[in-house]
Structure formats: structure tokens, C-alpha cells
């Protein structure tokens, strides 16, 4: 990796922990406008493995509002329009982080959390096993 | 949103800009092992849209790595495997949160930040302009 | 097919500036995520800037506040403005379609005095 020499004007951390606990500014700096995935795209109607987008609140999670995707068939839409079953929808997961409120329903104390997410579908090529 | 409580076993926090800046635990609870993209599936070779994934690395990042995918053709792989222009690759995107360092080069101070990333690619039906 | 046909690039003095371009056909700039990464000798390909089709932009961390990536719509073509050059910065650069392995051709800079 890259090694990063160290900023003097960085904030002393007189945490026991260091470098374990540290302090997040929760003013997000945000590239991108898009915030709901319906909006920023309409892959999910127009796509061969379409999907739809399922809103999963968790007040003692940060973001609070996750949306993740189920595929709406278990085969592809074929040229025709209909659900070609030797072909599946699959979903594309993704691990993100998330801030999980530790110990809980607490503002201003937060704990890193890996979490799964489907962020939509894609259409593969079945793994057939052959029998002897 | 929904109201929680607050529970009296908080810590304080000390901050002017309080509930803006919060303490954050990096030990990272993480529900899931995989953390290889290449690893957690080979959708990316047998999807219809493949992808590769390019390795993105910011030391100032938090996590320092992430995948991109890149949909290997601008069309689709057809039934005879070879790529049909009629239909289109297309990135599926997600916004996620990460830590920047900030001030930069500080190693226990940070913001939170959404960037936008390409998980996977998906086989989309093109939007066709018809000229009047 | 999309062709992206880079040029500029060549030697320069540390310290000195270079701007690569890369013209696209068909007239794909205006509405596809471009991209510029570098490939050093050994290293793998990394990004260098990136930039949207809402011209939102990204940077490499290496090259924060040196590099200015652009482009002319009209002209169908994407720009990397490169100052205050490094020897570190010795690649080979490519244009990129951003979400896709499509690629130009690769233009070498060499910084070094």
C-alpha cells in the first residue's frame, strides 16, 4: 500500500481504543445527486433479469433506508417477452458499510457494519451437472 | 421516521458541531466472509453482460479498496455466445458510504462520504429514438 | 464499435505540463462516463480521473489538485490537463469509456529531467 505521512493539525485521539474508535463528520460530501435508485435509472424495468426495489428501513442503522433488489423471475426475458427458464435472473450483491448505533438508540456513538445488499439482477448461463 | 428513545448509558459528546461529528467504532462487525468480489460468485463470467473488476485504491479512503466492474462488451452475448448489438451491456450502480480522511493524512478523523460505484452489468433492452 | 484515438504526451521536465486528448467515434462523449487511467512499468492499470456525463468529476489520489480531467462535447472529445508533473507520473496513460473495456491506445509520458 501507500504509506501517508502524518497531518500535525490531526485531532488528538485520547481514546484508549486508538485507532479503533475515531471521529466521523456525518456531513456527507456527496459526488452524486441521485439519492433513489428508481429515479437515477430504469435499467430495472428494461433489463433481460428485471427487478424491483424493496425499501428496508432500520432506525438504528446509518443510512436508515437501504433498498435492495429481488429479481422478478427466476429465468430471462427472452427477444419475445417471455421467461426463458434455461436461462436465470440472478441477483449482484454487494458488501457495503453501514453505521450501526453501538450501544444502541444512541446519536452520536456509531459502529461499522458490513452488510450484503442485492443492488440488482443479472441473467447467466444455468450451471448444468450432469449425471453418470 | 420512527422515534427512539435515547439510552441513558450514551456517551457524551463533548463536540460543538454535535450530533454532526460522532464517534465511530472501525472494529468491524461483519456478517459475511466473502470480501473478494471475484470470490463470492462467477456471475461475471457467465452473466449475458460479463464484467471485469479493476481494483480502485485510495489510502485517504476508508475502505481503501474498491471494485469497479467494467461490462466487457458495449452489446450482450447472444445463445450462440457471440455479442449482439441490438441490446446493450449496462452498469448497474450503487451509491455507497465511505470515510475520507479528513483533515487529510490523519489517521483517526474522518467524513463520511457517498461515491458512486459499478457493481455489475445487466442486459437491457435499448431505447430506440425513432426520427419524425 | 466505439474507437477512442488518443494523442499528445511525450517527455517533459519535472515540473512541467502536458494535456493528452482522445477523440471518440461514434459520438459517444456526450452520453457515457469517460475516463482516464495509467499503467506504470510493473504496476497495475489505476485510475487517474473520471467524469460523468453531469460533469461531476474524480480523482486518483496521487494526482488530487495536479491533474484536470474535461471535455468538449461539440468536439466529441475528452481532455486530461496535466501540471506540475512528477517523475512518478511516468506512464502509460489510456482513455476510457468509463464502464466498459474499451480503451484507447495508450500514449506514453515520460516525466524526467
Known amino acids: 500500500g501507500i504509506t501517508i505521512p502524518r497531518n500535525p493539525g490531526c485531532p488528538n485521539s485520547e481514546d484508549k481504543n486508538f485507532p479503533r474508535t475515531v471521529m466521523v463528520n456525518l456531513n456527507i460530501h456527496n459526488r452524486n445527486t441521485n439519492t433513489n435508485p428508481k429515479r437515477s435509472s430504469d435499467y430495472y424495468n428494461r433489463s433481460t433479469s428485471p427487478w424491483n426495489l424493496h425499501r428496508n428501513e432500520d432506525p438504528e442503522r446509518y443510512p436508515s433506508v437501504i433498498w435492495e433488489a429481488k429479481c422478478r423471475h427466476l429465468g430471462c426475458i427472452n427477444a419475445d417477452g417471455n421467461v426463458d427458464y434455461h436461462m436465470n435472473s440472478v441477483p449482484i450483491q454487494q458488501e457495503i458499510l453501514v453505521l450501526r448505533r453501538e450501544p444502541p438508540h444512541c446519536p452520536n456513538s456509531f459502529r461499522l457494519e458490513k452488510i450484503l445488499v442485492s443492488v440488482g439482477c443479472t441473467c447467466v448461463t444455468p450451471i448444468v451437472h450432469h449425471v453418470a | 421516521g420512527i422515534t427512539i428513545p435515547r439510552n441513558p448509558g450514551c456517551p457524551n459528546s463533548e463536540d460543538k458541531n454535535f450530533p454532526r461529528t460522532v464517534m465511530v467504532n472501525l472494529n468491524i462487525h461483519n456478517r459475511n466472509t466473502n470480501t473478494n468480489p471475484k470470490r463470492s460468485s462467477d456471475y461475471y463470467n457467465r452473466s449475458t453482460s460479463p464484467w471485469n473488476l479493476h481494483r480502485n485504491e485510495d489510502p485517504e479512503r476508508y475502505p481503501s479498496v474498491i471494485w469497479e466492474a467494467k461490462c466487457r462488451h458495449l452489446g450482450c452475448i447472444n445463445a450462440d455466445g457471440n455479442v449482439d448489438y441490438h441490446m446493450n451491456s449496462v452498469p448497474i450502480q450503487q451509491e455507497i458510504l465511505v470515510l475520507r480522511r479528513e483533515p487529510p493524512h490523519c489517521p483517526n478523523s474522518f467524513r463520511l462520504e457517498k461515491i458512486l460505484v459499478s457493481v455489475g452489468c445487466t442486459c437491457v433492452t435499448p431505447i430506440v429514438h425513432h426520427v419524425a | 464499435q466505439v474507437q477512442l484515438v488518443q494523442s499528445g504526451g511525450g517527455l517533459v521536465q519535472p515540473g512541467g505540463s502536458l494535456r493528452l486528448s482522445c477523440a471518440a467515434s461514434p459520438r459517444v462523449i456526450s452520453i457515457h462516463d469517460m475516463a482516464w487511467y495509467r499503467q506504470a512499468p510493473g504496476k497495475e492499470r489505476e485510475l487517474v480521473a473520471g467524469?460523468?456525463?453531469?460533469?461531476?468529476?474524480d480523482y486518483g489520489y496521487s494526482v488530487k489538485g495536479r491533474f484536470t480531467i474535461s471535455r468538449d462535447d461539440a468536439k466529441n472529445t475528452l481532455f486530461l490537463q496535466m501540471n506540475d508533473l512528477k517523475p512518478e507520473d511516468t506512464a502509460v496513460y489510456y482513455c476510457?469509456?468509463?464502464?466498459?473495456?474499451?480503451w484507447g491506445q495508450g500514449t506514453l509520458v515520460t516525466v524526467s529531467s
Open positions: 467524469i460523468t456525463t453531469r460533469g461531476i468529476t
Open positions: 476510457n469509456l468509463r464502464h466498459y473495456e474499451v
